[in-house]
C-alpha cells in the first residue's frame, strides 16, 4: 500500500525518495510520474534525472535536496487539489528487471484560511542528512565501479518514519531539523 | 596538485576546423566530468558541453551540436574539442574545466584557456 | 534554458564595505547553483558552490545563499584583491548557463 502524504491547497507538498549512489559519476536515472509505477518506466512523467542532471521537469515540479547524493525527493510548487493522487518514485537501476519503485499517495488538503508561510524547504533541506552515502575518501584518488551498487534500506526507513504524514505535517510547519 | 594544461593559441581561416586539447593531472582522470566553456571576448560564459572519460558519454549545448566535438584518450589522460566550420563567431577563449562531483559538478579547477582566432 | 539573470551589471564598493551580488534564475533550481570570480587574463575560479558552500581555501568573507529562483554573493568586508568579475551559474539542468557578470569595482 501506498504512503500518505499531505499538503494544504497553496503550499509546497514534499514526496520523499533517496537511494545511496555507489561513486562519483555514477548516478542511477530516476523518474517521477504522476499515478501508480507501472511495468516499465513511469506514466505521465512530471521529472527525470539521468547519469548526472535533471534532463527534464514540468512546471511546478523540481529536486530541492541533493540530487546528485542520491535525495530525490519531488516537491510539488503551490500545490490545488487536482495534484492529489498516485505518484510514482522509480530508480532505474541498469540490469533486467532491478528497478525500485515507491508509490506515494498525495493528499491535498483545503487551506484552512489563507496558507501560511511554509518552512517546507527547511524540512526538505533537512532530510538528506537522514542519508548516509558511502564514505568516498578523498576526492582525487576515486575510482569508479562499473555499476551502481544502490542500498536502498534509507527509502524503506525514511517512508516508515514517515508514515504518519501529521507528524511530517508538524515537522514542516515548526521547521524542525531531524538529524 | 590538479592541472588542466590547455593547447596554445591558434590563427586559423574561416571555414577551417580546428582541435585544441586540455590534459590532466594530479588525479584520477576517469573519475571526472570534462566540461567545456567558451568566453568571447569581454563577455559571459556559454557552456558547450562535457564528456566523462570514464565511459566516453557525452552530452552537448544544443547551440553547439555539430560545431563542437569532444573526445578523450584515456591513456594520456588527455580532453579534446574539435571546432568545425570555423567563423569569426567562434573567435574567443576556450576553457576546459573538470566537473567535480563533490562541488556538486561545478567547476573546481579550470585550464589557463586556449585563444581561438579565425580570420582571413 | 534557464536563464541566470545578476544585478547589479556594475557595483561600485569602498574598501572595508559590504559587496552584495543578485542571481535570479528563470526556473527553479534547488541549490544548483554556483559562484565564480574571474580576473582579467585568468579564467574563473570556484568560490561557492551548491548555493552556500564555501570551496577549499576561499577566504571567509564570501559567502553564498539562497534557494530556488534567488541567490546572493556576499563579500563581507570588501579587499583591493577583490576587484574581479564575478558569475553565477546554474548547474541544476543542461544546458548550464550563467549569469553576464557583475563587475566589481572600488568606490
Known amino acids: 500500500s501506498e504512503v500518505e502524504y499531505r499538503a494544504e491547497v497553496g503550499q509546497n507538498a514534499y514526496l520523499p525518495c533517496f537511494y545511496t549512489p555507489a561513486a562519483p559519476g555514477n548516478l542511477v536515472p530516476v523518474c517521477w510520474g504522476k499515478g501508480a509505477c507501472p511495468v516499465f518506466e513511469c506514466g505521465n512523467v512530471v521529472l527525470r534525472t539521468d547519469e548526472r542532471d535533471v534532463n527534464y521537469w514540468t512546471s511546478r515540479y523540481w529536486l530541492n535536496g541533493d540530487f546528485r547524493k542520491g535525495d530525490v525527493s519531488l516537491t510539488i510548487e503551490n500545490v490545488t487539489l487536482a495534484d492529489s493522487g498516485i505518484y510514482c518514485c522509480r530508480i532505474q537501476i541498469p540490469g533486467i528487471m532491478n528497478d525500485e519503485k515507491f508509490n506515494l499517495k498525495l493528499v491535498i488538503k483545503p487551506a484552512k484560511v489563507t496558507p501560511a508561510p511554509t518552512r517546507q524547504r527547511d524540512f526538505t533541506a533537512a532530510f538528506p542528512r537522514m542519508l548516509t552515502t558511502r564514505g568516498h575518501g578523498p576526492a582525487e584518488t576515486q575510482t569508479l565501479g562499473s555499476l551502481p551498487d544502490i542500498n536502498l534500506t534509507q527509502i524503506s526507513t525514511l517512508a516508515n518514519e514517515l508514515r504518519d504524514s501529521r507528524l511530517a505535517n508538524d515537522l514542516r510547519d515548526s521547521g524542525a531539523t531531524i538529524r | 596538485q590538479v592541472q588542466l594544461q590547455q593547447s596554445g593559441p591558434e590563427l586559423v581561416k574561416p571555414g577551417d576546423s580546428v582541435k585544441m586539447s586540455c590534459k590532466a593531472s594530479?588525479?584520477?582522470?576517469?573519475?571526472?566530468?570534462m566540461d567545456w566553456v567558451k568566453q568571447s571576448h569581454g563577455k559571459s560564459l556559454e557552456w558547450i558541453g562535457y564528456?566523462?572519460?570514464?565511459?566516453?558519454?557525452?552530452s552537448y549545448n544544443q547551440k553547439f551540436k555539430g560545431k563542437a566535438t569532444l573526445t578523450v584518450d584515456k591513456s594520456s589522460s588527455t580532453a579534446y574539442m574539435e571546432l568545425h566550420s570555423l567563423t569569426s563567431e567562434d573567435s574567443a577563449v576556450y576553457y576546459c574545466a573538470r566537473g567535480g562531483y563533490y562541488s556538486y559538478y561545478s567547476y573546481d579547477y579550470w585550464g589557463q584557456g586556449t585563444t581561438l582566432t579565425v580570420s582571413s | 534554458d534557464i536563464v541566470m539573470t545578476q544585478s547589479p551589471d556594475s557595483l561600485p564598493v569602498s574598501l572595508g564595505e559590504r559587496a552584495t551580488i543578485n542571481c535570479k534564475a528563470s526556473q527553479s533550481v534547488g541549490n544548483n547553483v554556483a559562484w565564480y570570480q574571474q580576473k582579467p587574463g585568468q579564467p574563473p575560479k570556484l568560490l561557492i558552490y551548491?548555493?552556500?558552500n564555501r570551496y577549499t581555501g576561499v577566504p571567509d568573507r564570501f559567502s553564498g545563499s539562497g534557494s530556488g529562483t534567488d541567490f546572493t554573493l556576499t563579500i563581507s568586508s570588501l579587499q583591493a584583491e577583490d576587484v574581479a568579475v564575478y558569475y553565477c551559474?546554474?548547474?541544476?539542468?543542461?544546458?548550464?548557463?550563467f549569469g553576464q557578470g557583475t563587475k566589481l569595482e572600488i568606490k
Open positions: 551548491y548555493a552556500s
Open positions: 564528456i566523462y572519460p570514464n565511459n566516453g558519454g557525452t
Open positions: 594530479g588525479y584520477t582522470f576517469t573519475d571526472y566530468y
Open positions: 551559474q546554474q548547474h541544476y539542468s543542461s544546458p548550464y548557463t
